[in-house]
């Protein structure tokens, strides 16, 4: 079909029309100069045609190759632990919006980065296998143009709070380290919660092609919809969460709270926020200090834990974090035992008293008194998000809400033992914390953000979009790298997929029209015979 | 007022290394960051690496990366920068300096007097 | 690395005249950017530091300004003493870069 109309679009259907017509009043002669004229004509039209294309064509692609590829590198130092993420894009492409992706993902054995403050001559050490993954993944030839940046995220942000000295060691003992490798090592800083916020924003909505202004012939970008309506995004970290999205309405509700960019030629107002100390860790943490504030004894028992599960817990391990000062109170006791019961319902419970819901200054809030304008169009859930719900196998677009907290349930009051034998290879420190932040992130994004059993189908956890990861990296290389430009760049008229078929097409035309110029032409007049 | 003192002066044979000391003295060292900054006849100032003595951890610039050394001894104050595979373009005033802070507040404070180093065949 | 940039190379001036020094960076520092004084035979002395707050013992004739990538060390009314070479530095990434230095000579 496809290639009846391109034959019909080059004049070769009429070529075929005259050669099949019926000619028996025709004398031989007369046939000849005929079809000798005609097909000359054609022959010509189609030729001048098929090399007008292929030069415009050429000319106005002009595509440099061999392509001269470009490396990045940046750590993500969480609060509990650091990954370190390389990408690589087409140099002559660095401002199309969708070229960067990931090539490797390296994750650095070890905690985060804010625990080693009483051990910072180990940092070193730390980060030398991840260091060294990049310098055999990166070519040499590469190293000393391949940005090398590092974004401390919460686990900084409250060690800094405790103490800035101490952060500030820290962080000038990764800068001594990384600085030591063959790269353009372009500093360790703490990003600002804002920040997390709009560069997993601006990630997620330029692995989907939402930056994009070009149509395309197909997509290949999963959860893609129609319009180039942007997704909003949620992040789940140890220490803290973000929400930013583009709501219906500009609101100046709360300054705080907005964001304006000019991408690629279009200007969004986003809405951000990040909660410090609502991570799944530091959560579970405020959720554990409040709770043994009314404990009868050194005995908590916990609807959050699985059934027979036990756990001796340090109280000044308990305080270490500013995340728990709130619930601070003297203790008759050193240590408590968590004792799991493994009831969804209580826990879901306990999980919405860490959200302060009783007061809001604004329109519309989220928790402790935030600003939420009303939730608009798709939303990305990524990092825990995505991890924990994975674990659960509660990821498909196709289960409901309603289903989510069904298996929740079940899930959650399966004994211990069991849970273990089911999952032997499952690190137990990880296992045993499912439950609780299953149900803290239903908690989260039912109460905490407003998302309901039907917005609950726009919620997409997402791992990775087109083998690279969803989470703030991305977005925060490409801004250091100035390859977000502000404004729609000049680019080449064609994807480079569709040029290389048109060039082929038309290739293909003018060896068919030479093809079939010989055989007319170059042939005895046994040939016309046949064709009378 | 802390004050660098640096070992005198040193002639070298090509490819040999040389073992240059800085002793704080009036004070400690402390956390503070001690640099190596070498200054070539009628040249400018180039960085060649540092080192946090009370955690042993330093850094070094690409160029002088796999052929300096620089350690520290906390319990004499002292901090050493070894230099190997010496050439003729490595003659030059060899200073240590003191960093008055930690993250990205490595301005040079304190100087020592300077320490230098010929290499000749 | 960053790339320090230091102009003119040789400034003349007459004593009691203004002095001013330039500074560029190849990228931004912020103001993480540190002068120094050095005269024939010593080391260096630093002047300023975060572009414009003076080192203990300095004079205020001795004046930095800037941010990011353009800085300036101005020297009010040059004295004898103040002929001397003038280095600045970045200490906001390593490997910590300095410029090439301004000459001050005596015109």
């Known amino acids: 079909m496809l290639f009846d109309s391109i034959l019909s679009t080059v004049g070769l259907s009429k070529l075929v029309s005259v050669v099949s017509s019926p000619a028996a009043a025709l004398s031989k002669s007369n046939v000849k100069t005929f079809c000798s004229k005609n097909i000359l004509a054609i022959l010509g039209f189609s030729s001048i045609i098929a090399v007008i294309a292929l030069l415009a064509v050429g000319l106005t692609q002009n595509k440099a190759l061999p392509e001269n590829i470009k490396y990045g590198i940046v750590l993500d130092a969480g609060s509990s632990h650091t990954s370190l993420y390389i990408y690589k894009w087409p140099a002559e492409k660095e401002n199309d919006t969708g070229v960067v992706h990931q090539v490797e993902e390296c994750r650095v054995k070890g905690p985060g980065i804010s625990k080693y403050v009483q051990k910072v001559n180990e940092i070193g050490i730390y980060l030398t296998d991840c260091m060294e993954r990049a310098r055999e993944v990166i070519p040499r030839s590469q190293h000393q143009e391949t940005p090398v940046y590092l974004g401390a995220t919460a686990g900084m942000r409250l060690l800094r709070m405790e103490s800035e000295e101490l952060a500030d060691r820290v962080l000038d003992v990764v800068e001594r380290s990384l600085s030591n490798y063959p790269f353009d090592f372009q500093g360790a800083r703490i990003i600002t919660g804002q920040e997390e916020g709009a560069y997993g924003w601006i990630t997620i909505n330029y692995l989907l092609g939402k930056f994009s202004q070009k149509t395309r012939w197909f997509s290949i970008v999963p959860y893609e919809t129609n319009n180039q309506e942007t997704f909003g995004a949620l992040d789940l970290g140890g220490a803290s969460t973000q929400i930013t999205f583009v709501p219906q309405n500009q609101t100046t509700e709360s300054p705080d709270n907005a964001l304006q960019f000019r991408l690629y030629g279009k200007d969004y107002n986003v809405y951000t926020h990040s909660f410090l100390c609502y991570g799944k860790d530091q959560a579970l943490w405020q959720k554990l200090a409040k709770d043994i504030q009314v404990a009868s004894n050194e005995i908590l028992r916990d609807p959050c834990f699985h059934p027979g599960y036990k756990k001796v817990v340090n109280v000044s391990d308990l305080y270490k974090t500013p995340c728990t000062k709130r619930f601070e109170m003297t203790l008759p006791f050193q240590q408590f035992e968590i004792q799991g019961i493994g009831n969804y319902q209580q826990c879901h419970q306990s999980v919405l008293e860490l959200f302060n819901t009783s007061y809001c200054p604004y329109s519309q809030c989220a928790f402790n008194g935030i600003f939420l304008p009303p939730l608009q169009g798709d939303f990305g859930a990524f990092s825990a998000f995505y991890f924990v719900m994975n674990f659960l196998n509660l990821t498909s677009e196709k289960v409901s809400q309603e289903k989510v907290t069904e298996m929740m349930k079940k899930f959650c009051s399966q004994p211990w033992e069991e849970i273990k034998t089911s999952y032997a290879g499952v690190k137990e420190k990880y296992l045993s914390e499912y439950c609780f932040s299953g149900t803290y992130i239903l908690s989260l994004l039912l109460q905490g953000y407003h998302f309901t059993a039907d917005s609950w189908e726009h919620i997409h956890f997402i791992g990775k979009i087109q083998g690279s990861d969803a989470g703030w990296t991305l977005g925060y290389m490409l801004n250091l790298t100035n390859m977000i430009p502000a404004e729609q760049p000049l680019s080449t008229p064609l994807s480079h997929s569709t040029y290389v078929f048109l060039m082929v097409l038309f290739s293909l035309v003018l060896v068919i029209v030479a093809i079939i110029g010989l055989l007319i032409f170059h042939k005895p007049s046994y040939f016309w015979k046949d064709m009378v | 007022q802390v004050q660098l003192v640096q070992s005198g002066a040193e002639v070298k044979k090509p490819g040999s290394s040389v073992k240059v000391s800085c002793k704080a003295s009036?004070?400690?060292?402390?956390?503070?960051?001690i640099s190596w900054v070498r200054q070539a006849p009628g040249q400018g100032l180039e960085w060649m690496g540092s080192i946090i003595p009370e955690f042993g951890i330093a850094n070094y610039a690409q160029k002088f990366q796999g052929r300096v050394t620089i350690t520290a001894d906390e319990s004499t104050s002292t901090a050493y920068m070894e230099l190997s595979s010496l050439r003729s373009e490595d003659t030059a005033v060899y200073y240590c300096a003191r960093e008055s802070g930690t993250y990205r507040d490595h301005r040079l404070d304190v100087w020592g007097q300077g320490t230098m180093v010929t290499v000749s065949s | 690395e960053i790339v320090m940039t230091q102009s003119p190379a040789t400034l003349s001036v007459s004593p009691g005249e203004r002095a001013t020094l330039s500074c560029r960076a190849s990228q931004s520092v912020g103001s993480n950017l540190a002068w120094y004084q050095q005269k024939p035979g010593q080391a260096p002395r630093l002047l300023i530091y975060g572009a414009s707050t003076r080192a203990t013992g300095i004079p205020a004739r001795f004046s930095g300004s800037g941010s990011g990538t353009e800085f300036t060390l101005t020297i009010s009314s040059l004295q004898s003493e103040d002929f001397a070479v003038y280095y600045c530095?970045?200490?906001?990434?390593?490997?910590?870069?300095f410029g090439g230095g301004t000459k001050v000579e005596i015109k």
């Open positions: 009036g004070g400690t060292f402390g956390s503070y960051g």
């Open positions: 530095q970045q200490y906001l990434l390593w490997p910590l870069t």
